[in-house]
């Protein structure tokens, strides 16, 4: 090899790099050395390139032509085929033609950002150049033709289209199976249709932030089964529904901050089982409902700062067993910390909770129950006045506690806090000064002498009358009463909550009077009126009484709205035969749902019940008695009962039975002159009619024959020989006839035979 060629006159050299940037060049330097691998021609005044200038550059791989005045993709002559990276950003290129790129057989990186390109046609990027990274950001692209990038399907890994004017993406716009990063942020996209991104099998990062997306159609991200990160910040989304997330099975991070999302739908997350980080900051959320994120069992970081969350239902975080970081800064969840317990249940792995700037005035004893593993708690930016005894005690792993408040009420109830903080070495991030009493104003709680933490008065309101659990009939008026006392003359405000949410248009009556026992103490009463109650009024009611020193929360009183039961089905009288099945119907409505109970003849211990022949079918309001017996006959009562009262309806069960003998009719032998009785004791329903026969004929009665009124007993007196014969008892009712027979034998009158034996 000959001696190394010198550096070009207008340039500087370092290794195999030639830097001709920022020299005001209008044309290529003529003496480019052949050893050049990297050529920097940026920040010049080049409006066109002479391909001949690149004839003798066999090692050229990297060309920087950014910040010039080129209007088209230049040809680099013979060097085109081995250039790997071509930087053309910040020129005046208006379009890209496939013919301009055909010669770049080795091109892997092409930067066309910050030019004047207005459209991308499917002729722009031909098959050939193995481009891996294509940057078209900061152009004026409004149209993306279907298949515009198909020519790059075998090579393209990163595509940047940010800061353009794209308003719409065609369905299946990209057939780029190797693409891992797609950047579409800062465009004008309004809608993502289903299957828009199908064909991007390898995509890992999709950036759609700062568009105007208001709707994600079902299946919007279908096909992105390898995607890890989705950016949708700064759009106009109002909700995240389940269908739109369908197919995002590998998603790790979802960025949705700075939208207008007002509600989290529980079912929205079932397709994102691997989600680790969910960012919903700067939205319009006002509440977190129970189990609204329960599907996200792998979620590690949840950011909900800068919303308007004022209500966190108990169990709102249920299912988030892997969550480590929960950011709730700048919301309005004071009530959750001041009163509720259980809001954070389910967060077994949480190590960091931030609640900065939530207007929290006090910390309730059980506010953080369920967060025993917490290591970092930020309560800064809250004008905290009081912390209930032992509020943080169960957090054995707490390493950092942030409190910054100059509003502390330094009374006997706060005395525990300074030693506890110091004992746990948590005072480093606690700036806590007293506002009251006046003698301690401005003093750090850590410097206040123990004897100064005294309760000479009760500035914060104290509940003296709690609202009481009550039951009301639909349509009635009811009222809840709540009273509190305070030694402060600070203005008092009243609020009522139903199921932990403030009632905005509550019908309230408030008044104040001086407490009789102590002229210094004011008693404040608030009455909540509920007019013509409906089922919608049911719930747990609580009053919140607030003054400058804090809020006091009453017990929660339950209102149950009742409706007296009324029958929708009543039992009817029935008549049936024995051994068959009796069926009685009974159903009732009411609120709460009434319970149905059955009785027979006023009691619950009856044959069908005892013998397990009674069956109640709760789903179809039917009462059955199987294998009906005569004893089952009677009056059955159906009683429908709820907390409002009870009603009853009766039905008579009549049991029909074919006639039968209770006692068998036996043959008899009597002597002349004696009296004989034949009993035909029959049962049956209706009671059978009994007729006596002698032989085949109805019995002829004489003065010697006597029948009881029901014909069940036949008495024959002074029996004569002619009375002998076959007697038949015939028992008949509407169900049938039964017969029984008795052979009557008559012996001669009693006397002595010649042989000495007795007759009769």
């Amino acid at each position: 090899a000959g001696p190394r060629a010198p550096c070009a006159a207008a340039c500087t050299c370092a290794g195999d790099s030639l830097d001709c940037g920022g020299r005001g060049l209008a044309a290529l330097p003529g003496d480019l050395p052949s050893w050049t691998r990297s050529l920097n021609l940026s920040y010049n005044k080049l409006s066109e390139i002479d391909p001949a200038g690149f004839e003798d550059l066999p090692n050229l791989q990297e060309v920087y032509l950014n910040n010039n005045e080129l209007t088209a993709v230049p040809s680099l002559g013979a060097a085109s085929s081995h250039v790997v990276s071509l930087f053309l950003q910040h020129n005046k290129i208006r379009s890209v033609e496939g013919s301009q790129l055909k010669a770049y057989l080795s091109l892997e990186v092409l930067d066309l950002s910050l030019n004047n390109i207005t459209e991308v046609r499917n002729t722009c990027f031909p098959h050939g150049p193995p481009i891996k990274e294509l940057n078209l950001a900061g152009n004026r692209i409004g149209t993306l033709e279907l298949g515009a990038f198909d020519g790059l399907s075998r090579s393209l890994l990163t595509l940047r289209l940010s800061k353009n004017r794209i308003t719409q993406l065609p369905v299946r716009a990209f057939k780029l199976p190797r693409l891992t990063q797609l950047d579409l942020n800062r465009n004008r996209i309004r809608l993502i249709e289903g299957l828009t991104f199908q064909g991007l099998n390898s995509l890992e990062v999709l950036k759609l932030q700062r568009n105007n997306i208001s709707k994600l159609t079902d299946g919007a991200f279908w096909g992105l089964s390898k995607m890890h990160v989705l950016h949708l910040e700064y759009n106009s989304l109002v909700e995240v529904n389940s269908g739109s997330l369908y197919g995002l099975t590998a998603l790790h991070q979802l960025h949705l901050s700075n939208n207008s999302i007002a509600r989290i739908h529980r079912k929205g997350w079932s397709f994102c089982q691997k989600l680790h980080e969910l960012v919903l900051s700067f939205n319009n959320l006002t509440r977190l409902d129970e189990e609204s994120l329960a599907e996200l069992s792998s979620l590690s970081v949840l950011r909900l700062s800068h919303n308007s969350i004022s209500h966190i239902a108990e169990g709102a975080f249920k299912g988030l067993r892997s969550l480590r970081v929960l950011d709730l800064d700048h919301n309005e969840i004071s009530g959750t910390i001041e009163d509720t317990s259980g809001a954070f249940s389910g967060l077994d792995s949480l190590s960091k909770l931030t609640l900065f700037g939530n207007k929290i005035k006090s910390v309730a004893k059980r506010a953080f129950s369920g967060l025993e593993g917490l290591e970092h708690l930020n309560l800064g930016g809250n004008a905290i006045r009081s912390v209930q005894f032992d509020a943080f005690v169960k957090m054995k792993n707490l390493k950092e506690l942030h409190i910054s408040s100059d509003s502390f009420l330094c009374d006997c109830q706060l005395k525990w806090l300074p030693p506890w903080l110091i004992g746990r070495m948590l005072q480093a991030f606690v700036t806590a000064t007293c506002a009251h009493p006046e003698s301690l104003k401005g003093q750090s709680i850590f410097s206040v002498p123990p004897e100064s933490f005294v309760c000479d008065d009760f500035l914060k309101p104290q509940i003296i009358t709690q609202p009481e659990t009550t039951m009301a009939m639909v349509g009635k008026d009811i009222r809840f009463t709540c009273s509190a006392a305070s030694s402060s003359s600070s203005p008092m405000t009243f609020a009522w909550k139903k199921d932990n949410e403030v009632l905005t248009n509550a019908d309230m009556e408030n008044f104040v009077h001086v407490h009789a026992q102590d002229g210094e103490v004011m008693e404040y009463t608030t009455i909540l009126h509920l007019r013509q109650v409906t089922f919608g009024h049911e719930g747990r009611y609580q009053c919140v009484i607030t003054n400058h020193f804090g809020s006091t929360y009453s017990h929660k009183a339950r209102l149950t709205v009742n409706v007296l039961p009324s029958f929708t089905k009543t039992p009817h009288d029935i008549t049936i035969r024995t051994t068959t099945m009796a069926r009685l119907e009974c159903a009732a409505t009411g609120h709460p749902n009434p319970q149905i109970a059955w009785q027979k003849d006023g009691g619950t211990d009856f044959p069908a019940a005892r013998e397990r022949r009674m069956h109640v079918m709760p789903d179809d309001d039917v009462f059955f008695i199987t294998d009906v017996k005569i004893d089952d006959a009677g009056v059955y009562s159906c009683t429908a009962q709820n907390s409002a009262g009870s009603i009853s309806a009766n039905a008579t069960l009549t049991v029909l039975e074919t006639p039968s003998l209770v006692v068998p009719l036996e043959d008899r032998v009597v002597s002349v002159g004696e009296t004989v009785a034949l009993q035909c004791k029959a049962t049956g329903n209706p009671p059978p009619r009994i007729t006596w026969f002698k032989g085949d004929r109805p019995l002829s009665l004489t003065e010697r024959h006597h029948l009881t009124p029901d014909n069940q007993l036949l008495v024959v007196q002074n029996v004569v020989a002619e009375d002998a014969g076959r007697y038949t008892c015939e028992m008949s009712n509407t169900l049938g006839t039964e017969r029984a027979h008795s052979q009557l034998s008559v012996l001669p009158a009693a006397g002595c035979r010649k042989d000495g034996t007795t007759v009769g």
């Epitope: 300074p418 110091i422 004992g423 401005g442 850590f446 002498p449 123990p450 004897e451």
Partner: antibody, heavy 117, light 107 residues
Framework: QVQLVQSGAEVKKPGASVKVSCKAS????????LHWVRQAPGQRLEWMGW????????KYNQKFQGRVTITADKSASTAYMELSSLRSEDTAVYFC??????????WGQGTLVTVSS | DIQMTQSPSSVSASIGDRVTITCRAS??????LSWYQQKPGKAPKLLIY???ILHSGVPSRFSGSGSGTDYTLTISSLQPEDFATYFC?????????FGGGTKVEIK
């Protein structure tokens, strides 16, 4: 670091007054309570009173009420304890101390006051 | 005033010994109990405050326990520099009051 430096030893006659100073450094003088404690020979330590320099509130042990006055000069970060109507049993080492959770975390080196005719 | 009764008034021990000093208050002092070490001609040095919190720079062989009216200072393994007089003091009410002291001497 926190330091409390007291004035030197004093010898006084019965009936006279003594004023002992305590200069604080290494912390915000107006944010902490300063106490005065004395130790007479062979006696247990005896608390005399405190001052909160931030608002110059004071509290005294009733035993010394009327004889002791504690003051502070915020600009000089210095507290003073003046004991009047001295008697021989007031002979003791007088300490200033800064409190933390009811305990005296930082002490001055002590000032011996001898009352003798 | 709350009376503080310290016992024993003196104890003789050897290096490495475990030493326990007790302090009883005449009424509940809500854990506001401090322990001091004092050497002749010096100001007392805070060892423990609020019953069991070790003041910065104090060796971990010193520990405190107790509640209500009864409190204990324990030196787990006596070192040569630990021979001194130890005082307890209640900080719950005014006036602050001190125990009579326990002198720990070399056996």
């Amino acid at each position: 670091q926190v330091q409390l430096v007291q004035s030197g030893a004093e010898v006084k006659k019965p009936g006279a007054s003594v004023k002992v100073s305590c200069k604080a450094s290494g912390y915000t003088f107006t944010s902490y309570y300063l106490h005065w404690v004395r130790q007479a020979p062979g006696q247990r330590l005896e608390w005399m009173g405190w001052i909160y320099p931030g608002n110059v509130n004071t509290k005294y042990n009733q035993k010394f009420q009327g004889r002791v006055t504690i003051t502070a000069d915020k600009s000089a970060s210095t507290a003073y304890m003046e004991l009047s109507s001295l008697r021989s049993e007031d002979t003791a080492v007088y300490f200033c101390a800064r409190e933390e959770l009811g305990g005296f975390a930082y002490w001055g080196q002590g000032t011996l006051v001898t009352v003798s005719s | 005033d709350i009376q503080m009764t310290q016992s024993p008034s003196s104890v003789s021990a050897s290096i490495g010994d475990r030493v326990t000093i007790t302090c009883r208050a005449s009424q509940d002092i809500s854990n506001y109990l401090s322990w001091y070490q004092q050497k002749p001609g010096k100001a007392p040095k805070l060892l423990i405050y609020y019953t069991s919190i070790l003041h910065s720079g104090v060796p971990s062989r010193f520990s405190g326990s107790g509640s209500g009216t009864d409190y204990t200072l324990t030196i787990s393994s006596l070192q040569p520099e630990d021979f001194a007089t130890y005082f307890c003091q209640q900080g719950n009410t005014l006036p602050r009051t001190f125990g009579g002291g326990t002198k720990v001497e070399i056996k």
